[in-house]
């Protein structure tokens, strides 16, 4: 018969759009050899997995490349990694361990993933004061974004003379050379998480002294 096991931890997890979440899963400690097979994560009610390590199995197009089975039987790990979370990912999921040659496998309990609106905003760092005619490096960062996600796209909007400096995965530098007339104008850092199609921004007023 189909064997069942309980996913440890909460029955639901929350993630913001564009970010990442790990759905924890531990394989049963007593796993008969004949039951050992490939791992599959399913959306409740679906036949096609969202993630698997089965080389012959297709996964849902919507989750391909974003959902990954973290497979390590030595550590009993069968967790699901979700990156670039989208609203449509809001659902219940379960894990199944099965060999295609066998009638039965191991099926986990369900876990709900709740995808909320992105409320995190970028941080703009201005080192020291802005002086007319003096160049300064402004940094826009999204330190709350996850490493494994699709790198975000940074955009800057300003009336002041600017050029782009170096960028890292989660930060962008803007070189600004303000003029007296730029005092009180807006400077916006816009960050787009293309993997999920969401954008967040922060606007500050320039204080040129």
């Amino acid at each position: 018969q189909e064997r069942r096991f309980q996913l440890e931890g909460p029955e639901s997890l929350t993630v913001q759009e564009g970010l990442c979440v790990l759905v924890p899963c531990r394989l049963p400690t007593t796993l008969p050899a004949s039951y050992y097979g490939y791992g599959y994560w399913f959306l409740e009610g679906a036949d096609v997995p969202v993630a698997t390590n089965d080389p012959d199995e297709e996964v849902q197009e919507e989750t391909r490349g974003r959902f990954h089975l973290l497979w390590d039987p030595r550590r009993k790990n069968c967790s699901l990694s979700i990156r670039d979370a989208r609203r449509r990912d809001n659902a219940a999921y379960f894990f199944r361990l099965k060999s295609k040659w066998m009638k039965y496998g191991y099926t986990s309990s369900k876990l709900s993933v709740r995808v909320m609106a992105l409320t995190h905003r970028p941080k703009i760092l201005i080192p020291g004061t802005l002086e007319p005619g003096h160049s300064k490096n402004l940094t826009c960062s999204v330190s709350w974004a996850c490493e494994q996600g699709t790198p975000p796209i940074f955009s800057w909007l300003s009336a002041a003379p600017t050029s782009l400096g170096p960028r890292t995965t989660h930060s962008s530098v803007l070189i600004i050379t303000p003029r007296p007339q730029d005092h009180g104008t807006n400077l916006t850092c816009q960050v787009k998480f293309a993997g999920a199609g969401v954008t967040t921004e922060r606007t500050i007023q320039l204080n040129v002294t």
């Epitope: 008969p32 050899a33 004949s34 080389p55 390590d72 039987p73 030595r74 060999s99 040659w101 009638k103």
Partner: antibody, heavy 116, light 107 residues
Framework: EVQLLESGGGVVQPGRSLRLSCAAS????????MHWVRQAPGKGLEWVAV????????HYADSVKGRFTISRDNSKNTLYLQMNSLRAEDTAVYYC?????????WGQGTMVTVSS | DIVMTQSPSSLSASVGDRVTITCRAS??????LNWYQQKPGKAPKLLIY???SLQSGVPSRFSGSGSGTDFTLTISSLQPEDFATYYC?????????FGQGTKLEIK
């Protein structure tokens, strides 16, 4: 007690056919994948074929593809290997084995000798 | 097909020795590796599955490790009944190929 008992082996001439049987007992046969593995005299193990619990899925080693057919009768708790166009290199002990991606139970084997 | 290569092909050791047998796959097989023991005139017996999981009833002196392409079977302290031939087998994709075997003999 889980048991697999092979039968049907013997001496056969090249080009002829032979059917091996494997009687299973002590477990729910219809829930398990089943394999045939062979071992030529003094040689290592060679995986031959696998069949899914319901017979809907089958895979073969390249060396026997098109000549051997694996099948099962769940009502009789029996696994079969139909061997056609036999060659000298098919001479081996044939083991029936239980499992999915891991073989956990083996039969004692039946000897097949292909010789003129 | 995935080719499994075992080394050494034969090995002489004494009771109490620590012995290591290695198995290499021609491509990544994740953790889908099994180890079997076979004694002359007998059917093989499953020792380790999923690269490192000990089969029920197998003594704890047997252990397996590895992932991807390189795997190891270790016998921590050889017992007289351990002298046999050992085979690795990949169960990642069909055909489920075996290594050529490692014969463990008494020194």
């Amino acid at each position: 007690e889980v048991q697999l008992l092979e039968s049907g082996g013997g001496v056969v001439q090249p080009g002829r056919s032979l059917r091996l049987s494997c009687a299973a007992s002590g477990f729910t046969f219809s829930s398990y994948g089943m394999h045939w593995v062979r071992q030529a005299p003094g040689k290592g193990l060679e995986w031959v074929a696998v069949i899914s619990y319901d017979g809907s899925n089958k895979h073969y080693a390249d060396s026997v593809k098109g000549r051997f057919t694996i099948s099962r009768d769940n009502s009789k708790n029996t696994l079969y290997l139909q061997m056609n166009s036999l060659r000298a290199e098919d001479t081996a002990v044939y083991y029936c084995a239980r499992g999915g991606q891991t073989i956990d139970i083996w039969g004692q084997g039946t000897m097949v000798t292909v010789s003129s | 097909d995935i080719v499994m290569t075992q080394s050494p092909s034969s090995l002489s050791a004494s009771v109490g020795d620590r012995v290591t047998i290695t198995c290499r796959a021609s491509q990544s097989i994740s953790s889908y590796l099994n180890w079997y023991q076979q004694k002359p005139g007998k059917a093989p017996k499953l020792l380790i599955y999923a690269a490192s999981s000990l089969q029920s009833g197998v003594p704890s002196r047997f252990s397996g490790s590895g992932s991807g392409t390189d795997f190891t079977l270790t016998i921590s302290s050889l017992q007289p009944e351990d002298f046999a031939t050992y085979y690795c087998q990949q169960s990642y994709s069909t055909p489920y190929t075996f290594g050529q075997g490692t014969k463990l003999e008494i020194k």
